[in-house]
């Protein structure tokens, strides 16, 4: 399914537990269209099946076009008084939309990542804190569940809990964005 849109070690800590981030603007500060792949260069693809979209992690054949995702970036502010784990200040949050009106969402109960059709304003489950990592990789941390990241499990996207004391170096939560 092609996109129908027109248009590293991490640089800091985790989102504080139990924190309330306020997104400082209802419109994104910027947007970009990029393909998403894993640290091991498998592609994230999206397919319409039985009137709903499925998300796959797979090796693409050489000539197959990669699916593009619209990434919309928002700023969010942490009041210092709320930061229990030593992270306060301005964070970069992102929503990911592979096709018009559909957004990736965290399902924390099922520990899954799903595509849902929804209208704006988007629910909190559609927002992820963006972490830059070395090797120009990124990670996506759930706004609704700090310490939980989008990751790869059994050739699917899943929500993966990362211990706060860990270095967040696990490759299964690292992704590459390619705008070409």
């Amino acid at each position: 399914m092609g996109s129908s849109h027109h248009h590293h070690h991490h640089s800091s800590g985790l989102v504080p537990r139990g924190s309330h981030m306020s997104i400082t603007g209802i419109s994104p500060i910027t947007e970009s269209l990029a393909s998403l792949s894993t640290y091991n260069d498998q592609s994230i693809t999206f397919a319409l099946e039985d009137e709903s979209y499925e998300i796959y992690v797979e090796d693409l054949k050489k000539d197959k076009k990669k699916d593009k995702v619209l990434l919309s970036y928002y700023e969010s502010q942490h009041p210092s008084s709320e930061s229990g784990d030593g992270v306060d200040g301005k964070m970069l949050m992102v929503t990911l939309s592979p096709t018009k009106d559909f957004w990736l969402q965290a399902n924390n109960k099922e520990h899954s990542v799903e595509l849902h059709k929804c209208e704006k304003p988007l629910p909190d489950q559609a927002f992820f804190v963006l972490h830059n990592r070395s090797f120009n990789c990124v990670s996506f941390e759930c706004k609704t569940d700090p310490g939980v990241f989008i990751g790869v499990k059994d050739n699917h996207l899943a929500l993966i809990k990362v211990d706060y004391s860990e270095n967040l170096g696990s490759e299964n939560i690292l992704f590459k964005l390619s705008e070409t």
């Epitope: 800091s12 970069l92 972490h131």
Partner: antibody
Framework: QVQLVQSGAEVKKPGASVKVSCKAS????????ISWVRQAPGQGLEWMGW????????HYVQKFQGRVSMTTDTSTSTAYMELRSLRSDDTAVYYC???????????????WGQGTLVTVSS | DIQMTQSPSSVSASVGDRVTITCRAS??????LAWYQQKPGKAPQLLIY???SLQSGVPSRFSGSGSGSDFTLTISSLQPEDFATYYC?????????FGGGTKVEIK
């Protein structure tokens, strides 16, 4: 208010090392990454590398690899940059700069130290 | 590495003039570009980030635009305090890189 205060000017001989400090105040130190940027006299800005104040992870520009070390001391909210085997072309003002997003380097540097002049001369 | 090329390297202008500085990247990226102002003997100051977002406290006469390979900083009406050197910086990927600078001088 946010402040980054750097150590004073240094004069070093070729082959020596220099360690520049950058003391942060006015924000939670371990929330933001710190980069080091240098500027030779009359020249432009050159990024040297970055360190996460949260966990000490770092990334150095290839040309400085093996000669530079960036560290942090969270107990004193201070970042350090050590440059070894100094040469005359390392003469520059060295700046520390805070990344403007807590978890991302995409936003540039929103606060800078006042700069430390390092002169390398025999 | 992404190389950033700024033009012009210097520009002479008068108070009240509209000044435009361009920055071209050796390879395209989305919008993670910042602009800084630097005065002699001082540290740079962030003006614009994400190509077009105005940093808090920066006067609205400064604006940024562009994406891909070409970016622009515009000063709509030059003020006496705006005579300085301006740098672009790509914040898209490591290594982070700066343009060579544009000196805005008094005509």
């Amino acid at each position: 208010q946010v402040q980054l205060v750097q150590s004073g000017a240094e004069v070093k001989k070729p082959g020596a090392s220099v360690k520049v400090s950058c003391k942060a105040s006015g924000y939670t130190f371990n929330s933001y990454g710190i980069s080091w940027v240098r500027q030779a006299p009359g020249q432009g800005l050159e990024w040297m590398g970055w360190i996460s104040s949260h966990n000490g992870n770092s990334h150095y520009v290839q040309k400085f690899q093996g000669r530079v070390s960036m560290t942090t001391d969270t107990s004193t909210s201070t970042a350090y940059m050590e440059l070894r085997s100094l040469r005359s072309d390392d003469t520059a003002v060295y700046y520390c700069a805070r990344h403007s997003y807590t978890t991302s380097w995409y936003g540039g540097f929103d606060y800078w130290g006042q700069g430390t002049l390092v002169t390398v001369s025999s | 590495d992404i190389q950033m090329t700024q033009s012009p390297s210097s520009v002479s202008a008068s108070v009240g003039d509209r000044v435009t500085i361009t920055c071209r990247a050796s390879q395209g990226f989305s919008s993670w570009l910042a602009w800084y102002q630097q005065k002699p003997g001082k540290a740079p100051q962030l003006l614009i980030y994400a190509a077009s977002s105005l940093q808090s406290g920066v006067p609205s006469r400064f604006s940024g635009s562009g994406s891909g390979s070409d970016f622009t900083l515009t000063i709509s009406s030059l003020q006496p305090e705006d005579f300085a050197t301006y740098y672009c910086q790509q914040a898209n990927s490591f290594p982070l890189t700066f343009g060579g600078g544009t000196k805005v001088e008094i005509k």
